[in-house]
């Protein structure tokens, strides 16, 4: 699909280029073009210019507002990469490293463990956790990953949860859990990821990540 889009874009660009060249040739009075063709092309071009000039004043008026609007409604997005930690805490650690995203100061990674947003609204929040476990080496309980929310003035709550049973592969079997959903976040709200056994989490490139996007 992308390849077809690219071809389409290039085709349109080529047509625009040919049109501009034709206007240029009309202006220089090249004999290879009929007068009728030139008149038609010129009036088409004048129409475009007239539209542009008419819209110019409106655009001028709107422009300052559009700029403000752009400033006031910036994209808010974050994507952070897992970080191996010596801490025994069940909350996963993250870092701004590798191919990460931190759009602006309206979202921050705090204490390496939680993404905190400064603007209220609907957010798509996701986490991918890859872990390597073995049925014999692990307890009977499944591996559980939880996406949690802490809002100002409110208790922590679990937003999403997923569980996988342990693999029989040796020394361990790799499995991935993906969590994702749309949630209302308040200013100052933080989201973080909890797992039952952080020692089983895989920190290789691309295996475990966490992020959000304001809709």
């Amino acid at each position: 699909h992308r390849r077809l889009d690219k071809i389409e874009d290039e085709r349109n660009l080529h047509e625009d280029f040919v049109f501009m060249k034709t206007i240029q040739r009309c202006n220089t009075g090249e004999r290879s073009l009929s007068l009728l063709n030139c008149e038609e092309i010129k009036s088409q071009f004048e129409g475009f210019v007239k539209d542009i000039m008419l819209n110019k004043e409106e655009t001028k008026k709107e422009n300052s507002f559009e700029m403000q609007k752009g400033d006031q409604n910036p994209q808010i997005a974050a994507h952070v990469i897992s970080e191996a930690s010596s801490k025994t805490t069940s909350v996963l650690q993250w870092a701004e490293k590798g191919y990460y995203t931190m759009s602006n100061n309206l979202v921050t990674l705090e204490n390496g463990k939680q993404l905190t947003v400064k603007r209220q609204g609907l957010y798509y929040i996701y986490a991918q956790v890859t872990f390597c476990s073995n049925r014999e080496a692990s307890s009977q309980a499944p591996f559980i990953a939880s996406l949690c929310l802490k809002s100002p003035g409110r208790f922590e709550r679990i937003l999403l949860r997923a569980a996988n049973t342990h693999s029989s592969a040796k020394p361990c079997g790799q499995q991935s859990i993906h969590l994702g959903g749309v949630f209302e976040l308040q200013p100052g709200a933080s989201v973080f990821v909890n797992v039952t056994d952080p020692s089983q989490v895989s920190h290789g490139t691309g295996f475990t990540s966490f992020g959000l996007l304001k809709l």
């Epitope: 403000q68 609007k69 006031q72 409604n73 309206l106 400064k118 603007r119 209220q120 609204g121 609907l122 100002p152 003035g153 409110r154 208790f155 209302e184 308040q186 200013p187 100052g188």
Partner: antibody
């Protein structure tokens, strides 16, 4: 149509208690967050607290636990219980429904006047 | 708590005038600011939230702007029904706080 109607206001002596009601219609208090705001004579608006859709509550710490927000979902009514009332609690009390994804108050009641005086 | 300072506290204007009310916060609000209109004996009405978003049913002559600690409500052409009091509200941090209000009177 979304409507909020406060009642229960009136004259009360200092140290007394009062329970204000906010009857909501056109929406369910379990789906929306309902806030209480007051305005003392000649003063600005003061946010008091909120009961979230899931029943949790958050308060303005300035109010020192004298005020409690609760609700009766079967009656679709939210309450503000006010204890140990003082003269400075004299105000018009409003309940208001929050806009879905913002901490802003999109629909308000007309307010009920509470006068604390001996 | 975040302090909200609104100015002016009152102003006199004529129908058709452009009116600007400002609100200054004691810390960065990251655009978490709303404006309300209140007429005597009536419930407050939400005009603008998220600094510039117009609430449902609010005429386009009302607009909001600003960033950081400084925010503005503008009425491009004052109408007879706009004579009222206006309040700003921050919802960035608990407790949510309001400005002291600006009364717009007929000149």
């Amino acid at each position: 149509e979304v409507q909020l109607v406060e009642s229960g206001g009136g004259l009360v002596q200092p140290g007394g208690s009062l329970r204000l009601s906010c009857a909501v219609s056109g929406f369910s208090s379990t789906n929306y967050h309902v806030h209480w705001v007051r305005q003392a004579p000649g003063k600005g608006l003061e946010w008091m607290g909120v009961i979230w859709g899931d029943g949790d509550t958050s308060y303005n710490s300035v109010l020192k636990s004298r005020f409690t927000i609760s609700r009766d979902t079967s009656k679709n009514t939210v309450y503000l219980q006010m204890n140990s009332l003082r003269a400075e609690d004299t105000a018009v009390y409003y309940c208001a429904r929050q806009l879905t994804h913002y901490y802003v108050l999109a629909a308000w009641g007309q307010g009920t006047l509470v006068t604390v005086s001996s | 708590d975040i302090q909200m300072t609104q100015s002016p506290s009152s102003l006199s204007a004529s129908v058709g005038d452009r009116v600007t009310i400002t609100c200054r916060a004691s810390e960065d609000l990251y655009y978490n600011l709303a404006w309300y209109q209140r007429k005597p004996g009536k419930a407050p009405k939400l005009l603008i939230y998220d600094t510039y978003r117009l609430a449902d049913g609010v005429p386009s002559r009302f607009s909001g702007s600003g960033s950081g600690t400084d925010y503005t409500l503008t009425i491009s052409s004052l109408q007879p029904e706009d004579f009222a009091s206006y309040y700003c509200q921050q919802y960035y941090k608990f407790p949510f706080t309001f400005g002291q209000g600006t009364k717009v009177e007929i000149k």
